[in-house]
Amino acid sequence: KEEQTTFRDCAEIFKSGLTTSGIYTLTFPNSTEEIKAYCDMDVGGGGWTVIQHREDGSVDFQRTWKEYKEGFGSPLGEYWLGNEFVSQLTGQHRYVLKIQLKDWEGNEAHSLYDHFYLAGEESNYRIHLTGLTGTAGKISSISQPGSDFSTKDSDNDKCICKCSQMLSGGWWFDACGPSNLNGQYYPQKQNTNKFNGIKWYYWKGSGYSLKATTMMIRPADF
């Protein structure tokens, strides 16, 4: 039996026997195009493809539509995997989304959505989510039904303001909505009373900017 040499996601890598967390090369569905991603092989059984990570403010997340489409940052640190890859991947099979959050007081929480996918670029990478569970709030901090993605140069929100310009970062802004994990990074003791910080309203409320965030996806049938 031939060994699999290309992998669609981190779950396939895990199942191939590579079970150490780290950077791996993934291949776009139905394509030879490659992308580097961080695979978390430890959390909740492993096999998670990390699509976003914040931890120290070392990477600027106030980026263009093109940059959010293609991805930016370093998979070893802060990064955004890329809307196009995630859209294509989650359009092929059913995926779950896990969001891990850390505050500045040493607390951790998570939100798990049992079905997650991004529409294509023609639909502004609109987010679709169902089935919320977890400890980071009983109500979804990503507006339901899902919103279109907006960046500083592509305003697709429902506000008479420009949410991405105002709140910083690309996100699925509503008007502007209860979350923004791509907001301005604020260090400890400067992280309160900030409307443009890293926000997850139904866990920490208004104005609290989080210490660290990770968004990761895995096939629902893993």
Partner: antibody, heavy 123, light 112 residues
Framework: EVQLVESGGGVVQPGRSLRLSCAAS????????MHWVRQAPGKGLEWVSA????????YYADSVKGRFTISRDNAKNSLYLQMNSLRAEDTAVYYC????????????????WGQGTLVTVSS | DIVMTQSPLSLPVTPGEPASISCRSS???????????LDWYLQKPGQSPQLLIY???NRASGVPDRFSGSGSGTDFTLKISRVEAEDVGVYYC?????????FGGGTKVEIK
Amino acid sequence: EVQLVESGGGVVQPGRSLRLSCAASGFTFSSYGMHWVRQAPGKGLEWVSAISGSGGSTYYADSVKGRFTISRDNAKNSLYLQMNSLRAEDTAVYYCARDLLDYDILTGPYAYWGQGTLVTVSS
Amino acid sequence: DIVMTQSPLSLPVTPGEPASISCRSSQSLLHSNGYNYLDWYLQKPGQSPQLLIYLGSNRASGVPDRFSGSGSGTDFTLKISRVEAEDVGVYYCMQALQTPPTFGGGTKVEIK
């Protein structure tokens, strides 16, 4: 389409009470901070009171503190201003206004305003 | 309370010409998040106020690009690059940094 419609204004004697209402539509009312701003005849704008989306936090101008009470009923998409011990200087058009940002802590800007309701305090 | 001072009180304008309104605050409106908490409103005759500019320099959706806001700290300016007849009314600046929010006294813009 966002709409704010005030009602309850009228002529009232000094020392009496009045309750203003603001009916909101076209947005998720419970997600937004709401405000009352007034304008005396021929004068400028004066902020009166504010309330958070949940109703848990309220704020007042010193000129009305202890006399006016702001409240909201999110089930009815309605904002209220209970005005007691009215004075001649409370005579104004009262506007209800909605915060620009939802789920937030700004005291403004005010993205949408109602048409206003006139309160006249006179003996 | 933060005191907002606008000038001029009245501004006669010629259509097609530029116009400028100044607003000064008694203390800095620059928040630690980098934004100036200063907004501009226009109240047209017989109407409610409408938001023009928020956070110092951001135009609200639907506001023509002939309107622009600038400034930082305590000194702010609203500029109209080419005044149109529909721009007449009273312009107010407002600080939203501290409670209570406070408005400037207003600048009445009228056609010459």
